[in-house]
């Protein structure tokens, strides 16, 4: 009689993560008597996957009834496949022995490859806000995919970015892989409503890529522009001075009025107006009693925006001039920007 052969007809099997893998194996003879066992890998370190008579293999079922008379089909199914299950599986015939059964003949092996979807890309931006014209870095990470081939693209408001670096790890063979990409984005004043998108395409996604997004509103800080103007006289000795705080983001802002360097009033931006580009405008006014001053008054509008060093703008109020004349000149002297740090 011809010597028993163990036949594994499939050189390779490709299975999606979560599905069931069928590993086929048949023997050509019933002799010698002894069990069939399945292993992953070869050599002394190989892992026992299924032993018909003994052991706990909750994910493994046999395709046919191994105890049926004249059964020579030793195929198995492995349920709920994960990337960690990838490898070469061997169907091995043992001959009855004592104290241990003796390996008699092995099949040629079936390579199980697992297709696993990448996780949803997670995009993260810089820890601190940055101002327009600065370049900031965004990272995108996705994990757990197999095979290794993957495509990653970056977009800002639908426009593809080119300044990025991507790594897929590990470099060598692995059960699953991770991708890490860093993109550089130059901020503009109009970026409050902008979005950065990381798009990942993989064979398991069937042409429907995964996307991760980051809103630049979390990253950008648009510093305000200040304008101090003197309004027409409201009463005989009173002058109304306004400080226009324009185009700032985020909203967190505190304004302090100083008269000749002395704090007159501090307020926090509350009722702001929003511009189309997502930035905010706010106006504060100060009623100055001119008769209380003998000399010229230097009025300073000092703004602390989002915890940054204060910026200020000053306006010189000439007390010597008649209030009515002074009030009619809305383009009164403006000393220009006088930026300084206040602590």
């Amino acid at each position: 009689e011809e010597e028993l052969q163990v036949i594994q007809p499939d050189k390779s099997v490709l299975v999606a993560a979560g599905e069931t893998a069928t590993l086929r194996c048949t023997a050509t003879s019933l002799i010698p008597v002894g069990p069939i066992q399945w292993f992953r890998g070869a050599g002394p370190g190989r892992e026992l996957i299924y032993n018909q008579k003994e052991g706990h293999f909750p994910r493994v079922t046999t395709v046919s009834d191994l105890t049926k008379r004249n059964n020579m089909d030793f195929s198995i199914r492995i349920g709920n496949i994960t990337p960690a299950d990838a490898g070469t599986y061997y169907c091995v015939k043992f001959r009855k022995g004592s104290p241990d059964d003796v390996e008699f003949k092995s099949g040629a092996g079936t390579e199980l490859s697992v297709r696993a979807k990448p996780s949803a890309p997670v995009v993260s931006g810089p820890a601190a806000r940055a101002t327009p014209q600065h370049t900031v870095s965004f990272t995108c990470e996705s994990h757990g995919f197999s095979p290794r081939d993957i495509t990653l693209k970056w977009f800002k408001n639908g426009n593809e970015l080119s300044d990025f670096q991507t790594n897929v790890d590990p470099v060598g063979e692995s059960v699953s892989y991770s991708i890490h990409s860093t993109a550089k984005v130059v901020l503009t004043r109009e970026d409050v409503h902008s979005q950065v998108i990381c798009e990942v395409a993989h064979v398991t996604l069937q042409g429907d890529p995964l996307r991760g997004t980051a809103n630049l509103s979390e990253t950008i800080r648009v510093p305000p522009t200040l304008e101090v103007t003197q309004q027409p006289v409201r009463a005989e000795n009173q002058v109304n001075v306004t400080c226009q705080v324009r185009k700032f983001y985020p909203q967190r802002l505190q304004l302090t009025w100083l008269e000749n360097g002395n704090v007159s009033r501090t307020e926090t931006a509350s009722t702001v107006t929003e511009n189309k580009d997502g930035t905010y405008n706010w106006m504060s006014w100060l009623l100055v009693n001119v008769s209380a001053h003998r000399d010229d008054v230097k009025l300073t509008c000092q703004v602390e925006h989002d915890g940054q060093p204060a910026v200020s703008k000053s306006h010189d109020l000439k007390v010597s001039a008649h209030p009515k004349e002074q009030g009619s000149n809305t383009a009164a002297e403006n000393t220009g920007s006088n930026e300084r740090n206040i602590y």
């Epitope: 892992e47 026992l48 018909q52 008579k53 003994e54 052991g55 241990d100």
Partner: antibody, heavy 114, light 110 residues
Framework: EVQLQQSGAELVKPGASVKLSCTTS????????IHWVKQRPQQGLEWIGR????????KYDPKFQDKATITADTSSNTAYLQLSNLPSEDTAVYYC???????WGQGTLVTVSA | DIVLTQSPASLAVSLGQRATISCRAS??????????MQWYQQKPGQPPKLLIY???NVESGVPARFSGSGSGTDFSLNIYPVEEDDIAMYFC????????FGGGTKLEIK
């Protein structure tokens, strides 16, 4: 549902024999080994032996070789443990268990007493 | 026969603390790359209940508080955090050559 149903408690005299049964359901009886395990009161677990119901191949712990006989009847999906020449030290709970470690019978208490 | 030496014989642990039980085999229980070592929990009047199989695999339905580790000849069962329901006897078992059991560890609450 997998079940291993063991026969009821036995009171036997020293020197006598007893045959315990383990009737299985919910799985292919011939698929896996059936093991028998002894547990004396407040003691540990002792492996007695096992049978392959597919071909009646048996193995025993040498200590039980002359004491125990394990058989199987595939027509009724039942495994048996026969214990002979019982001394009082064989007073114990005897369990049958499937080769997958998970499924155990509820145990049979054998009391050897004059 | 492969002899399994389990220690300690009894163990008193405070609720929420860690319990570690060791099991040493007289020879390797490796079957190729797989350690054929199991851990069971047994409560009075009940058959043993499988907790861990093949040294480190947690049986379905067993709380994640239970974990197993080791290979070759040295194995351990960890329970963390210990709960009231864990009061029981614990046994290791090898199936590399037939079956043998460790002597058992009685877990009590301090």
């Amino acid at each position: 549902e997998v079940q291993l149903q063991q026969s009821g408690a036995e009171l036997v005299k020293p020197g006598a024999s007893v045959k315990l049964s383990c009737t299985t359901s919910g799985f292919n009886f011939k698929d896996m080994y059936i093991h028998w395990v002894k547990q004396r009161p407040q003691q540990g677990l002792e492996w007695i032996g096992r049978i392959d119901p597919e071909n009646d191949d048996t193995k025993y712990d040498p200590k039980f070789q002359d004491k125990a006989t394990i058989t199987a009847d595939t027509s009724s999906n039942t495994a048996y443990l026969q214990l002979s020449n019982l001394p009082s030290e064989d007073t114990a709970v005897y369990y049958c268990a499937r080769g997958n470690y998970v499924h155990w019978g509820q145990g049979t208490l054998v009391t050897v007493s004059a | 026969d492969i002899v399994l030496t389990q220690s300690p014989a009894s163990l008193a642990v405070s609720l929420g603390q860690r319990a570690t039980i060791s099991c040493r085999a007289s020879e390797s229980v490796q079957y190729y790359g797989t350690s054929l070592m199991q851990w069971y929990q047994q409560k009075p009047g009940q058959p043993p209940k499988l907790l861990i199989y093949a040294a480190s695999n947690v049986e379905s339905g067993v709380p994640a508080r239970f974990s197993g580790s080791g290979s070759g000849t040295d194995f351990s069962l960890n329970i963390y955090p210990v709960e009231e329901d864990d009061i029981a006897m614990y046994f290791c078992q090898q199936s590399r050559r037939v079956w043998t059991f460790g002597g058992g560890t009685k877990l009590e609450i301090k």
